[in-house]
């Protein structure tokens, strides 16, 4: 979690002198409660913004949004706390809205926004806003909060954020499959504009069911430049395991601006429509484990056989 | 391919405790949060909470606060899911899931069935 | 609590029809709405979140109108895979709270 670093954020606005400032997210009124507090804010809303840095980069960000209750309690608020949590990481930042003068009410309702929280793709946070001074310990509570998922990069307006960007968004590989005689698999997916390895993870389950009857790994070598963006074809070899018929294909591509950690693409192929009764399958343990680089799979010829070329 | 495997079928009597496995393939556990789900019989869908591997920080429904604990271990990439002092209401099928807001994949589910 | 509404609770179409699911939030919840189809026997998958977004392998059939408290599933050519019970959730605040689901069946 971070602060965009331009443009300076503002919350003054008509009628309000106002400054932003980096907060530990521990009010000091937590400490020293006062006796009249403002109530909660109203209508708090969290949007997916896009904002540029001074460098150009493109990173989403979160558009916080809320209104002010219209009720004699504004005579009390001296400020705003506003708080993104990470939820899987449990990692917080905090900015404060600190009011250098007195609000009144107006003719219209005081409403403040915020843009400047910088969030990653594919993540969850909750965001939540504290008025000012923050309540004795039994007061009500004067805070609202929103939780707010960050869309991952298959949509189409991160796609073109930096951190999309650096993982591999641009690559569309248009991953074709299909199913030839003598159980085998050909895939056919578009090479991206530079010279790094894929890796092909095949992994087969049974008609109806999630956990694989077969898995298998195959390595593709970085192509030349003159194979830029060319079809490249594999055939895979698939065990011969009755009713083992829906097969999922998966891309991982290793980009210098990602190594490890691309972002993978995906075709499955469906079971015949009228499947025959499967036999019992072995329990199979998956031996690979997505986003990372290392395999502990075995030689090719233990798993099934494949060989492939690029086509110009 | 993320999976997610359920430890199997219990009965328990009332009063008693279960304990609930989850194990985790295809990523690395710590990256999302784990979220667990319960269906009764025949019924709708109930959120219970869910737990960060990463940090280990839980968030349990009012409903089931005290009364259930998540956990998880690492090192096998294993959540669990704990809950006490079982009633005949809470005869149902429980499932781990994935994420902690939008829950995108989910265990095969575990049925506890609470009988004396 | 929010609390979720679905409707209907069963809904009767025909293959390669339009089915159109419905699901009511109690107070706003802007855009933070999934939708899951759970088949008999089978844990539930996420098809859309974020109220529009299709999640990863789901085909473009699957959509979602709405925000704030009014949301439409739309199937927009029912396949023979897409009959199942269908349930809506709201991920706007805490607790996670679903809509008690709707039943497509065969007409």
């Known amino acids: 979690l971070r602060l965009l670093d331009f443009p300076a954020p503002v919350c003054a606005q008509e009628g309000l002198s106002c400054r932003v400032k980096n907060s530990t997210c521990l009010d000091d009124s937590w400490i020293h409660p006062r006796n009249l507090t403002p109530s909660s804010p109203k209508d708090l809303q969290i949007q997916l913004h896009f904002a540029h840095t001074q460098q150009g980069d493109l990173f989403p960000v979160a558009h916080i949004e809320w209104t002010l209750q219209t009720d004699a309690s504004i005579l009390y608020l001296e400020g705003a706390e506003l708080s993104v949590l990470q939820l899987n990481t449990n990692e917080r930042l905090c900015v404060r809205f600190e009011f250098l003068s007195k609000l009144r009410h107006h003719h219209r309702r005081w409403r403040f926004t915020f843009s400047h929280f910088v969030v990653d793709p594919d993540q969850e946070y909750e965001v939540t806003v504290h008025h000012l001074p923050k309540p004795i310990p039994d007061g009500d509570p004067n805070h609202q909060s929103k939780n707010f998922l960050v869309p991952d990069c298959e949509h189409a307006r991160m796609k073109v954020t930096t951190p999309c960007m650096s993982s591999g968004s641009l690559w569309d590989p248009n991953i074709t499959v299909e199913t030839l005689e003598a159980h085998q698999l050909r895939v056919s997916f578009t090479l991206w504009n530079e010279s790094t390895h894929y890796q092909i993870l095949l992994t087969s389950f049974p008609h109806m069911e999630n956990h694989s009857c077969f898995e298998h790994m195959h390595h593709i070598p970085a192509p030349r430049p003159e194979e830029f963006h060319q079809r490249s074809n594999v055939t895979l070899t698939l065990r011969n395991l009755k009713g083992c018929c829906r097969h999922q294909v998966q891309i991982q591509p290793f980009f210098s601006s990602c190594l490890n950690d691309c972002l993978r693409h995906s075709a499955t192929v469906s079971c015949p429509e009228m499947p025959d009764t499967p036999e019992p399958i072995p329990d199979y343990m998956p031996l690979w484990e997505p986003r990372s680089g290392s395999s502990d799979y075995k030689d090719d010829d233990d798993k099934g056989s494949s060989h492939h070329h690029h086509h110009h | 391919q993320v999976q997610l495997v359920q430890s199997g079928a219990e009965v328990k009597k009332p009063g008693a405790s279960v304990k609930v496995s989850c194990k985790a393939s295809g990523y690395t556990l710590t990256s999302y949060g784990i979220s667990w789900v319960r269906q009764a019989p025949g019924q709708g869908l109930e959120w219970m909470g869910w737990?960060?591997?990463?940090?280990?920080?839980?968030k349990y429904a009012q409903k089931f606060q005290g009364r259930v604990t998540m956990t998880t271990d690492t090192s096998t990439s294993t959540a669990y899911m704990e809950l006490r002092s079982l009633r005949s209401d809470d005869t149902a099928v429980y499932y781990c899931?994935?994420?902690?807001?939008?829950?995108?994949?989910w265990g095969q589910g575990t049925l506890v069935t609470v009988s004396s | 609590e929010i609390v979720m509404t679905q409707s209907p609770a069963t809904l009767s179409v025909s293959p390669g029809e339009r089915a159109t699911l419905s699901c009511r939030a109690s107070q706003s919840i802007s855009s933070n709405l999934a939708w899951y189809q759970q088949k008999p026997g089978q844990a539930p998958r996420l098809l859309i979140y974020?109220?529009?977004t299709r999640a990863t392998g789901i085909p473009a059939r699957f959509s979602d109108n709405g925000s704030g408290t009014e949301f439409t599933l739309t199937i927009s050519s029912l396949q023979s895979e897409d009959f199942a019970v269908y349930f809506c959730q709201q991920y706007d605040t805490w607790p996670l709270t679903f809509g008690g689901g709707t039943k497509v069946e065969i007409k």
């Open positions: 974020g109220a529009s």
């Open positions: 899931a994935r994420r902690q807001l939008a829950l995108d994949y």
């Open positions: 737990i960060s591997a990463y940090s280990g920080n839980t």
